[in-house]
């Protein structure tokens, strides 16, 4: 028994010594993010071992003081997602004694309203600004230099609109030295680690990116005021290209920023003539009007390997040639706004003319290979006979290393229906708790409710689908009961309300004229039933004195109403 593997924080990482009791997990955050929660978790012993605390998260703080700032990054809250409204964040950067600071603009994206980024050459809000997003339309590609050891960064957002915000990279540097260069989506090598005058730096881009603007090699010059002789280059994912490497990456234009609309890009990937190409499409998030097409050859007339629109999860393609042509056409009408919208394709040169081992048949199912020879790229699909379901992966692919992508699946009988659920105002009788084929569920409505639909459902096998109930669950509807017929008011009395029909559950009230008293129930109720009926016979009004009674009734005492005629709702 062990603890579960702790969740890696977004914009951070975790290292685990052991998942068994006594083991520990240590968390740390990427530059610009701060850990919220415990830095260190311990796996505690129990019947089910557990971590002694919740996994922490990495958050971009709204402001802070960074003393002894050597190299690092500050990012707006939520980055690379959008910041929130009504923020006022202040960061104070302070370089070690005797050093100055350089700032690189990694990304600045503010909403086009009253959101603002100001960078001040000093240590407080009054210091003179060296960058103000209100004043400057374009970011200075060479970045910013402090005159002293401080930079003061202010980010303020209003109550409307939001964007990705900002990521700034800072580097402290000594007098007589140049600042540490930076290239987004790339790397560099330096002739000396502290960048004194005379240092040369050579830049390269991450796979899939191309060096643009600036120079590949720059040099730290001018002993009086050390500076780089050229602007640092930029690495961009470009639209189109010819690639002859044995492995590499093709990225959507501008990745991970959104690609532009109305683009038509073509990449050619070429490997050695006797080799083939495995395409590993790791990210595919394009719009429904955008098209990514793979051609099995070196131009657009070759056989289409696959054509895709919209999002799709990780998949692989294999060519039958030594060339592949990738075409991406983005919809001119709609623009994609999201970060990391686009595609990431890794490609590898793979050997040809080899096959994966033969796969066996499986009980209660069959297999269908995509082609007779089990060469890399062949897909074998396993299916089960009706009433059976695939356990494991139904699709196995012969990989470039000539192993199958998944273990062999099996076919297990689907033997039960899902729980049909409770029905309001009813109870149910279940023949078997897990609803196997043949199980029945009987619904019995509560008193006062009538059943609409089938009272008994039976679980049946099906030919193509898994087992299903013979009918949908019924409903229990409130019973519509017949009303009681109105009773006449007693002689020398009155009734309320004076209606002909009274709904089940209704009550009528009786009263007598002055000088008369009520004999019987003053209120009687219409009792629901089949048929509905009055709860009591109607009362009579009797004179308060016997003389008055005889005078008023003229000795007509035998005329009390027949009980049966007034109690039955059917009359």
């Amino acid at each position: 028994l062990s603890c579960h593997f702790p969740r890696r924080p977004a914009y951070g990482d975790v290292t685990v010594t052991s998942l068994h009791p006594g083991g520990s997990a240590r968390f740390h955050c990427a530059t610009g993010y701060q850990l919220k929660g415990a830095r260190h978790l311990t796996c505690l012993n129990a019947t089910q071992p557990f971590w002694d605390s919740k996994e922490p998260v990495c958050i971009a703080a709204c402001g802070g003081v960074i003393r002894n700032a050597t190299t690092g990054r500050i990012v707006s809250p939520g980055f690379p997602g959008n910041y929130s409204n009504n923020l006022t964040c202040h960061w104070l950067l302070e370089a070690p004694e005797g050093q100055r600071l350089h700032l690189h603009f990694e990304k600045v994206s503010l909403a086009e309203d009253d959101d603002r980024l100001i960078i001040r050459n000093g240590d407080n809000v009054e210091a003179p600004p060296v960058y103000d997003s209100y004043e400057v339309e374009y970011l200075p590609i060479e970045g910013l230099l402090s005159s002293g050891k401080h930079f003061f960064v202010e980010l303020s957002t209003d109550s409307s609109g939001a964007a990705a915000g900002m990521a700034l990279r800072y580097e402290a540097f000594q007098q007589g030295h140049c600042y540490e260069p930076f290239v987004k989506y790339g790397n560099f090598s330096s002739s000396t680690p502290t960048y004194p005058v005379g240092t040369t730096v050579e830049f390269s881009c991450d796979p899939g990116y191309t060096l643009e603007q600036g120079s590949i090699i720059i040099e730290c010059v001018d002993p009086h005021d050390p500076q780089w002789n050229e602007t640092e280059p930029a690495c961009r994912a470009v639209c189109s290209g010819e690639i002859t490497d044995s492995a590499g990456v093709v990225l959507s234009p501008n990745w991970p920023e959104p690609y532009g609309r109305g683009q038509d890009c073509i990449w050619g990937v070429h490997v050695e003539e006797d080799k083939r190409i495995m395409l590993d499409i790791r990210v595919l998030r394009i719009g429904p009007g955008d098209v990514l097409t793979f051609y099995d050859g070196d131009d657009l007339t070759a056989r289409v390997l696959g054509q895709y629109s919209g999002p799709r999860s990780h998949f692989k393609l294999f060519t039958s040639m030594a060339d592949v042509t990738i075409q991406f056409q983005s919809d001119p009408g709609t623009s994609v706004l999201g970060y990391q919208q686009g595609f990431v394709i890794h490609f590898f040169e793979v050997p040809r003319n080899d096959t994966c081992p033969e796969l066996p048949e499986i009980p209660n199912g069959w297999k269908s290979p995509s082609q007779p020879e089990l060469v890399h790229g062949t897909v074998v699909t396993y299916q089960c006979y009706p009433g059976y379901q695939v356990v494991g992966s139904s699709v196995l692919m012969c990989q470039w290393d000539l192993t199958w992508s998944e273990d062999l699946p099996s076919c297990q009988r689907v033997t039960s229906c899902h729980d049909p659920g409770d029905v309001e105002h009813s109870r149910r009788l279940i023949s078997s708790p897990k609803f196997p084929v043949g199980a029945t569920v009987q619904y019995i409505c509560d008193q006062g409710f009538v059943l609409m639909g089938s009272s008994i459902l039976t679980c049946h096998d099906r030919q193509a689908g898994s087992p299903k109930w013979s009918d949908r669950a019924p409903k229990c509807l409130l019973e519509q009961l017949k009303p009681c017929h109105g009773l006449s008011a007693p002689e020398n009395g009155a009734r309320s309300p004076e209606k002909q029909l009274h709904p089940a559950g209704a009550t009528i009230h009786f009263s007598c004229a002055p000088g008369y008293v009520l004999k019987g129930q003053a209120s009687i109720k219409c009792v629901p039933g089949h048929p509905s009926h009055w709860s009591d016979p109607p009362p009579i009004c009797r004179a308060a004195s016997l003389d008055g009674f005889y005078n008023s009734r003229s000795l007509d005492v035998a005329k009390a109403p027949a009980a049966s005629s007034t109690l039955d709702a059917a009359h």
Epitope: Q383, G438, T458, C459, H460, R462, A464, G465, K468
Partner: antibody, heavy 116, light 112 residues
Framework: QVQLQQSGAELVRPGASVTLSCKAS????????MHWVRQTPVHGLEWIGG????????VYNQKFKGKVTLTEDKSSSTAYMEFRSLTSEDSAVYYC?????????WGTGTTVTVSS | DIVMSQSPSSQAVSVGEKVTMTCKSS????????????LAWYQQKPGQSPKLLIY???TRESGVPDRFTGSGSGADFTLTISSVQAEDLAVYYC????????FGSGTKLEIK
Amino acid sequence: QVQLQQSGAELVRPGASVTLSCKASGYTFTDYEMHWVRQTPVHGLEWIGGIDPESDNTVYNQKFKGKVTLTEDKSSSTAYMEFRSLTSEDSAVYYCTRGDWYFDVWGTGTTVTVSS
Amino acid sequence: DIVMSQSPSSQAVSVGEKVTMTCKSSQSLLNSRTRENYLAWYQQKPGQSPKLLIYWASTRESGVPDRFTGSGSGADFTLTISSVQAEDLAVYYCGQSYNLFTFGSGTKLEIK
């Protein structure tokens, strides 16, 4: 009300393929299997195969395996049957029909004539 | 495959008469777990698509007149029309769903 609307009549050459469609309306498409049945004077009613739109699982009459592919499109509540390598023996009225254990709704039928 | 045999292949009766047709399967259609017979009866009038009359061997589909009655269990089934009407002129098919689906060859009902 529940309806199954089938595509129009087809006249095809021997060896060709044909794809018939069946658009369902008036019920939740994924709640029932969709089957295909054909009718000829010689063989009467013959069950071809069925698809469960919820899982895309298909089942076929052994006689038509490899000759027929059943598919569906949940977004348009439409079932499709692709029939390949047609011969004159395949001239028939083709019905789509809804049902799990019995066929309670039948399509209008599509007449397929295979002739050179 | 389960084979379904229907008899007679055709039958002519007068309006108001009672008619009985039979359907035999090559194996039992009674599912011991669900206790149902997986047999249905269909009516096909000239120029029309088939229509479901009876399922589970004896349950009448809603809207079907009560002169139509299904009976039987296991491998022997009967469809009875208690008093034939002119609009009952049709071919009647039985069909099983115990193992995949197969239909009988039909009984043609003609009105004298």
